[in-house]
């Protein structure tokens, strides 16, 4: 078999909401992946496990069950939403993320995804980590190219 | 340290109005929410609503919407509770109380005002 | 609104025997951001009420270590491992998980 590629594009949006009181953050990141099987048979997308990590702790989770099918040859553009929470011992950054004397509050998150990819009864995955810049105070929508950027902040491997 | 202070005693008019005081200390008064809290003779806790002295948003318990008006005064650190068309019903001790960091519970209470309507 | 049901409702308890209070609402207090909002008060006779526990567990400054809470979801149990003369007094647990915030009805400590 050749090989499945998974490519993690980037962030595509983030929506923020707040809870004052309780000095909570809730963003809801969707991210974009292309998925190409180089194969000359189909390849089934099993699933799509994701989280997302904010200063080494685990912010969100999210899981995407039976996907997609990709054709010979084919590339896929699969888009999946990680709703992500920061309270409690992180609720600092509410003051930070709320802060009405800047325009731009960019907080550095983590972005971990696997692919579970099936053919012919054999399942594969598929892993890939990648720093993100996200604004935690608007909601934005993002250019898919301009968080390439971002592989600077890739520790080397 | 933190204080909370409230005065003991309001004698009231069925039908009238009265406005509650609680003056902080202590602590920034701006960084954590005030709560309002019900106690009858004998009874239980009811909670009234809260307030954010930064902005004066407020979260409203619905029992009690068209009761209590809740407002804060920054340049005095005071908080302030107006309850309007009182009836024997609202004869009780009415408590504020200043949320934690993370405005869940209630570490800090004033002494309480003693409500009493009668005519 | 959630309602809180605590019990029992008068508990006689001989010094230093330990006490169990139970709490129970009526929906989950599990918060959408995974933190459970529950919390216990005393209040002693002409006084105002005193946060013993937050967060289900968590001790407030000052607050001696016989005093601990536990529990999840609905259910959640406040325990006095030795109960002393100062212990004596009306306990609520309350929530702050959903508006409007809610008390339980109280359970009064009392001696045999």
């Known amino acids: 078999p050749r090989s499945i590629e998974v490519k993690y594009i980037g962030v595509k949006s983030a929506y923020v909401s707040y809870d004052a009181e309780k000095r909570t953050i809730y963003l809801n990141i969707t991210n974009t992946l292309n998925i190409t099987n180089n194969n000359y048979y189909s390849v089934e997308v099993e699933n799509i496990t994701a989280q997302v990590q904010f200063s080494k702790t685990v912010i969100g989770k999210a899981r995407l069950n039976n996907i997609t099918n990709i054709g010979p040859l084919d590339m896929k553009q699969i888009d999946y939403t990680v709703p992500t929470v920061i309270a409690e011992e992180m609720s600092y950054m509410y003051d930070f993320c709320t802060l009405l004397s800047i325009k731009v509050h960019n907080i550095v998150l983590m972005m971990q995804v696997t692919v579970t990819t099936a053919y012919f009864g054999h399942s594969e995955q598929i892993s890939q980590e990648r720093y993100q810049y996200v604004d935690c105070g608007r909601n934005t929508t993002y250019q898919l190219a301009q968080s390439e950027y971002l592989n600077v902040l890739q520790p080397q491997q | 340290q933190v204080q909370l202070q409230q005065p003991g005693t309001e004698l009231v008019k069925p039908g009238a109005l009265v406005k509650l005081s609680c003056k902080a200390s202590?602590?920034?008064?701006?960084?954590?929410?005030i709560h309002w809290v019900k106690q009858r003779p004998g009874q239980g806790l009811e909670w009234i609503g809260n307030i954010n002295p930064s902005n004066g948003n407020t979260k409203n318990n619905e029992r009690f919407k068209t009761k209590a008006t809740l407002t804060v005064d920054k340049s005095s650190s005071t908080a302030y509770m107006q309850l309007s068309s009182l009836t024997s019903e609202d004869s009780a001790v009415y408590y504020c109380v200043r949320g934690d960091y993370y405005g869940t519970s209630y570490p800090f209470w004033g002494q309480g005002t003693l409500v009493t309507v009668s005519s | 609104d959630v309602v809180m049901t605590q019990t029992p409702l008068s508990l006689p308890v001989s010094l230093g025997d330990q006490a169990s209070i139970s709490c129970r609402s009526s929906q989950s207090l599990v918060h959408s951001n995974g933190i459970t909002y529950l919390h216990w008060y005393l209040q002693k006779p002409g006084q105002s009420p005193k946060l013993l526990i937050y967060k289900v567990s968590n001790r407030f400054s000052g607050v001696p270590d016989r005093f601990s809470g536990s529990g999840s979801g609905t259910d959640f149990t406040l325990k006095i491992s030795r109960v002393e003369a100062e212990d004596l007094g009306v306990y609520f647990c309350s929530q702050s998980t959903h508006v409007p915030y809610t008390f339980g009805g109280g359970t009064k400590l009392e001696i045999k």
């Open positions: 202590g602590y920034t008064f701006t960084t954590y929410w």
